[in-house]
Interface confidence: low
Amino acid sequence: QTSADAIYDCSSLYQKNYRISGVYKLPPDEFLGSPELEVFCDMETSGGGWTIIQRRKSGLVSFYQDWRQYKQGFGSIRGDFWLGNEHIHRLTRQPSRLRVELEDWEGNARYAEYSYFALGNELNSYRLFLGNYSGNVGKDALLYHNNTVFSTKDKDNDNCLDKCAQLRKGGYWYNCCTDSNLNGVYYRLGEHRKHMDGISWYGWHGANYSLKRVEMKIRPEAFKP
């Protein structure tokens, strides 16, 4: 199998004319020793070819998980899930972009895109590397988290005396602590303005507003629709 034929991610599937969004299986990578991986592909947004790495839309899955769970992934691929830091690290070994899509409880949608996105390996605590921001969500609320490492409730790697993961009830690239908290607690309408540990993007609605929907998705920098 040549590298042109290989299926690495949703962009590979897109190039092979799979143009419908939904659940797909990525084959095992014998070279990297990685198993078959079930992914959800967004084949429509902004040219398609996106591999979704995180989704929050129902609140049915707790994101207050431990290091092992964030490493391997959790949730339900058609509902709320985290794809897994190990998988995200592997997918971003090729230069990738990140798109973050946000929706509030009033039905407004915004997005942020980053020209480069990568996670370090587990030895480097899945450190976050981000490129230039563009989008319509106002403040770049991931910039504060750039070049920080991942923390969970059982691994306090943040730059703070506070245990941010316990304070903000998630796993994330906590600094001291947040400008965004996309893996925070899902609060439903009516509860969504009352908490500091919700799914927040400080540049849009502020720290106390928990969003209705979030998707984080990646695709190679070199992708051409």
């Epitope: 419908i20 969004s21 939904g22 659940v23 797909y24 839309k57 129902s58 049915l60 899955v61 707790s62 949730g75 339900s76 058609r78 509902g79």
Partner: antibody, heavy 120, light 107 residues
Framework: QITLKESGPTLVKPTQTLTLTCTFS??????????VGWIRQPPGKALEWLAL???????RYSPSLKSRLTITKDTSKNLVVLTMTNMDPVDTATYYC????????????WGRGTPVTVSS | DIQMTQSPSSLSASVGDRVTITCRAS??????LAWYQQKPGKAPKLLIY???SLQSGVPSRFSGSGSGTDFTLTISSLQPEDFATYYC?????????FGGGTKLEIK
């Protein structure tokens, strides 16, 4: 009005292949998020999930029966077909097709079921 | 595979009674659980999805609760038409699995 209807033989001989058809109306299998599944129920026993097919042709099978099952769809004709090879008397059951709609794997609308007896 | 265990397997009750059926998953499934009602010779009917969301058209005397591994279906005041068999189903991951059923009979 949404309906699903199963059809196929009521009697099958051991080792033969069973082909069941689910004909549906009131929804389309080209709509994002829609799936059709097959579930069976042996007489006096519990429900057992067999297979699922989605609008994007994603297919899921029960691992214990995967080698014997094939699910296909014809979106233009609004039908889903399940084939099950090497039938055995323990496969005697009522076979249901049902719609899976939305974000979770549950079935909101069911056909009336078709009984299948495996006997020589 | 995720195993679903329902209890009791059968239950006798009277019209007007409050009835609770439980379902336990062999591993955490968050709130990815559905409940169905099945009458003899009929197809199952969806009652509850996402553990506690009432399916459209289902009477409000039916309610669901629970998260993780332990779930309950409650019928607040039994009506004659509620005597049937009830099944839980985990919708967290494939293979989808059903409980063994709870047969609700008239006392």
């Amino acid at each position: 009005q949404i309906t699903l209807k199963e059809s196929g033989p009521t009697l099958v001989k051991p080792t033969q292949t069973l082909t069941l058809t689910c004909t549906f109306s009131g929804f389309s299998l080209s709509t994002s998020g829609v799936g059709v599944g097959w579930i069976r129920q042996p007489p006096g026993k519990a429900l057992e999930w067999l297979a699922l097919i989605y609008w994007n042709d994603d297919k899921r099978y029960s691992p214990s029966l995967k080698s014997r099952l094939t699910i296909t769809k014809d979106t233009s004709k609004n039908l889903v077909v399940l084939t099950m090879t090497n039938m055995d008397p323990v496969d005697t059951a009522t076979y249901y097709c049902a719609r899976d709609y939305g974000d979770y794997w549950f079935f909101d609308l069911w056909g009336r079921g078709t009984p299948v007896t495996v006997s020589s | 595979d995720i195993q679903m265990t329902q209890s009791p397997s059968s239950l006798s009750a009277s019209v007007g009674d409050r009835v609770t059926i439980t379902c336990r998953a062999s591993q955490g499934i968050s709130s990815y659980l559905a409940w169905y009602q099945q009458k003899p010779g009929k197809a199952p009917k969806l009652l509850i999805y996402a553990a506690s969301s009432l399916q459209s058209g289902v009477p409000s005397r039916f309610s669901g609760s629970g998260s993780g591994t332990d779930f309950t279906l409650t019928i607040s005041s039994l009506q004659p038409e509620d005597f049937a068999t009830y099944y839980c189903q985990q919708s967290f991951s494939t293979p989808l699995t059903f409980g063994g059923g709870t047969k609700l009979e008239i006392k």
